[in-house]
Interface confidence: low
């Protein structure tokens, strides 16, 4: 259905009206209710195309959850039954590297990606004859593209002979998975704001269907990188926005990830949360953090969904989610994707192809262990996919899922035909499963990553590692020179070393004051409206990071602009990554950095460290033999026992799993 105030063809410069035909082996016939697999004949620009569709069984489930709120703000949890949904993926017969994401709920609606063009299709409103409009995505009116992509000609294989049997869906999708050999799973959570909900006529079903459609489109784009999108939850702010959306895109993104960390993660585990907003930000279609997909505090993005189609909007969400997955903008780099603009072009709209640069950026993220949370195949109670043995997702009622019969031949633990464990097996997958057996309790499964982190161990009765926890925010680190913040000890020298190499260190305070008082791209305290904010003297240590003793120039897949400012006998070095207005700047001082006695940086301001809500008296609570973790439980030193570290034991916490195994004392940390 068209959105209120949005005429069906007003956004198109050109379109055709067609009548698709459902195809059976015997004859063409008028459409009938949807099924697991279906084929249609459609016409586009004088040509007939046969499209083969298969229900996207990995997308949604038995246990799909939608969160909404009543008038008084009470959370309502709904499990709509949409197992036999009408969202499909597929390909165009005889067209190499084509892909399709369509819904067949009330007519055909979706995207067809051919070699040289992408088409949108949707039912013609008020037609009783199954008429549809079909249009090139290039013919959708949008802001002029800012495109700096260098498109190399891609050698094209000749199309298969049309008489040849079409490839199976599995073969087709395998053929497209050329980037990384191991499938990654993004557990995506979508949040829809109040204004967008109002714009959809306050119809929760319509919002839900639109977001499922969106997830199907995203899956069809990401599959080329061997990434699957699994929609693990939807929240609609039916009663009012739960964050302040006043201010610039950066403010709203900051508010959203703070809300996510405080309220959403505890309710539903996920890898990335994307906020869908109606409100625009003066030409900024969205904003997201780069490379933060597995971060507790920053794995999110915001996306503006105003008067555009869901097909066009899908490329915006694909772009912002791409940032979370480590992808930088393509502009100014030698990138190609076989189209005139790629998803990660800073101004692209309606693109569906990821570029070679995006693939490389994502590969870098995985090599640097920034994508470890993408390896887990969603658990049955977290993945919303219609249960199906053989889809490599462990669905409700399954104990394991090794995939196709051929893949299952290589799996020693899982019975491929039933998706049950083999008789001798305790487990088939997970960090605490080895050779079909649970690893013994006390086996380290997630090591300590910094002085502000704590290790986790297998518990001996589960294939999964204990949930990740770290030292409580606000605990002193680096010999009292810094505070722990989200598992990292945040201090200036370490940040300088990440950017400028191991010998770099923080510049003197005067550097920060001098440079950050300017309010330009090299020295500022954030962005407000269309201009950089000057730092007040008291906030200068929370603006652009200033370093000295620089001997290496950073390379992060993109070449940043570097500025050197002489100040009182030293050179202050700063950096502008020029990532664009939709990406927070990694050249700024990190949140949680100690900017004075009892003070930390937050939102480019030097504020009282009490905002971290650190409330752990380690002497009283942990008897001086431990620290508090992010669940506010004691993590005891080796030699002392949880929960309060007052009796002898082997360290750890109630959250970490046992640190000791009676059978093997060598397993202790």
């Amino acid at each position: 259905a068209a959105r209120p105030g949005f005429q069906q063809t007003s956004h198109l410069s050109s379109y055709e009206i067609i009548t698709p035909w459902r195809l059976t082996r015997e004859r063409r016939e008028a459409p009938r209710p949807y099924s697991k697999q279906v084929s249609y004949v459609i016409q586009a620009e004088g040509k007939e195309h046969i499209i083969h569709l298969e229900r996207n069984k990995d997308l949604l489930p038995e246990d799909f959850v939608v969160y909404t709120y009543n008038k008084e703000g009470t959370l309502i949890t709904d499990h709509p039954n949409i197992q036999n949904h009408c969202h499909y993926r597929g390909y165009v017969e005889g067209v190499h590297n084509s892909s399709i994401a369509l819904s067949d709920c009330f007519g055909l609606r979706g995207l067809l990606h051919l070699e040289n063009a992408s088409y949108g299709i949707e039912p013609l409103q008020n037609s009783s004859h199954f008429e549809h409009i079909i249009y090139r995505m290039d013919d959708v009116y949008k802001e002029p593209l800012k495109c700096g992509v260098s498109n190399k000609d891609i050698e094209k294989e000749t199309a298969k002979d049309e008489e040849e049997e079409p490839p199976s869906m599995t073969q087709l999708l395998r053929r497209r998975r050329a980037v990384l050999p191991q499938t990654r799973y993004v557990e995506l959570f979508i949040v829809v704001d109040k204004e967008r909900y109002d714009m959809m006529g306050r119809n929760q079903t319509a919002v839900r269907e639109e977001m499922i459609l969106l997830a199907n489109y995203l899956d069809s784009m990401y599959i080329m990188l061997n990434i699957r999108i699994v929609l693990v939850g939807l929240e609609i702010w039916t009663n009012g926005n739960l964050i302040n959306i006043v201010g610039g895109a950066g403010d709203v993104l900051g508010n959203f990830v703070q809300w996510r960390e405080k309220f959403l993660i505890t309710r539903r585990r996920h890898d990335s949360a994307q906020l869908v907003l109606k409100k625009g930000f003066g030409g900024t279609a969205g904003m997201a953090f780069v490379g933060t997909v597995c971060s507790r505090s920053h794995a999110g993005g915001i996306n503006v969904f105003g008067q555009i189609t869901v097909e066009t909007f899908a490329s915006i969400v694909a772009h912002e989610l791409g940032h979370n997955l480590g992808m930088n903008h393509d502009d100014g780099r030698d990138c190609s994707c076989g189209a005139k603009s790629c998803i990660m072009n800073s101004g692209a709209s309606g693109s569906r192809n990821f570029s070679s640069c995006s693939a490389e950026d994502f590969e870098k993220l995985t090599l640097n262990k920034g994508g470890n949370c993408l390896l887990n195949i969603p658990k049955p109670d977290e993945a919303y996919s219609a249960p199906s043995c053989g889809n490599k997702l462990v669905d409700a009622g399954e104990e394991c899922d090794c995939g196709t019969p051929k893949e299952c031949e290589l799996d020693p633990c899982c019975e491929g035909s039933t998706c049950k464990l083999k008789s001798f097996a305790e487990c088939a997958y997970g960090d605490c499963c080895k050779d079909c057996r649970f690893l013994p309790g006390g086996t380290l499964c997630r090591g300590k990553t910094s002085e502000c982190d704590v290790p986790e161990y297998c518990n001996g009765s589960s294939q999964f590692c204990q949930p990740d926890v770290f030292i409580q925010n606000g605990y002193p680190c680096q010999n009292n020179k810094a505070y722990c913040y989200n598992g990292m000890c945040q201090y200036y020298d370490a940040q300088c070393q990440v950017i400028f190499g191991s010998k770099a260190k923080a510049a003197p305070k005067d550097c920060f004051i001098e440079v950050n008082s300017k309010g330009d791209r090299f020295g500022n305290c954030g962005f407000s409206g269309n201009e950089y904010k000057k730092c007040a003297t008291g906030n200068a240590l929370c603006g652009k990071l200033q370093c000295e003793n620089v001997q290496e120039i950073p390379v992060f897949g993109i070449v940043p602009a570097i500025i050197q400012t002489p100040s009182r006998g030293t050179k202050c070095w700063g950096v502008d990554f020029q990532l664009g207005s939709d990406v927070p700047d990694p050249g700024m001082v990190n949140e949680g950095t100690k900017c004075g006695a009892g003070k930390i940086c937050r939102n480019f301001q030097c504020v009282d460290a009490s905002v971290l809500n650190y409330d752990c008296d380690v002497q009283k609570k942990c008897h001086g033999h431990g620290v508090c973790n992010s669940n506010k439980n004691c993590h005891c030193e080796n030699g002392w026992a949880p929960p309060n570290c007052e009796t002898k034991g082997y360290g750890g916490s109630v959250d970490s799993g046992p640190t000791y195994n009676e059978m093997n004392t060598a397993l202790r940390d």
């Epitope: 709120y69 703000g73 109040k194 009663n239 926005n241 739960l242 964050i243 302040n244 006043v246």
Partner: nanobody, 125 residues
Amino acid sequence: EVQLVESGGGLVQAGDSLRLSCAPSGGIISNYHVGWFRQAPGKEREFVAAISASGTSTAYAGSVKGRFTISRDNAKNTAFLQMNTLKPEDTAVYYCAASEYVFRYYDDSRYYAYWGQGTQVTVSS
């Protein structure tokens, strides 16, 4: 754009009472949860009391519980803060704020989109 106007502040003796009012210009107060916050010189702004849009839920900071009462009269398009047994430590600028967000975040100033200019309350001993 909703603008909030506070009134009723002033200078009183310890143990006295005051009634603050909050009225919106350009909006209907029944559409919003209303909160009162205060800021003493050199201190952070702190939550005082809040009332939900329907008036069925109220919440108070521990330091004012039992002494202050928040209420609303939607017919008069006004919210009130009745302050009894005032103490010197109640001295501050009192701000009225309105929120369209979920009421469970009543004590977090980030969730209030609309704010008044504030009214000074001074309690002498």
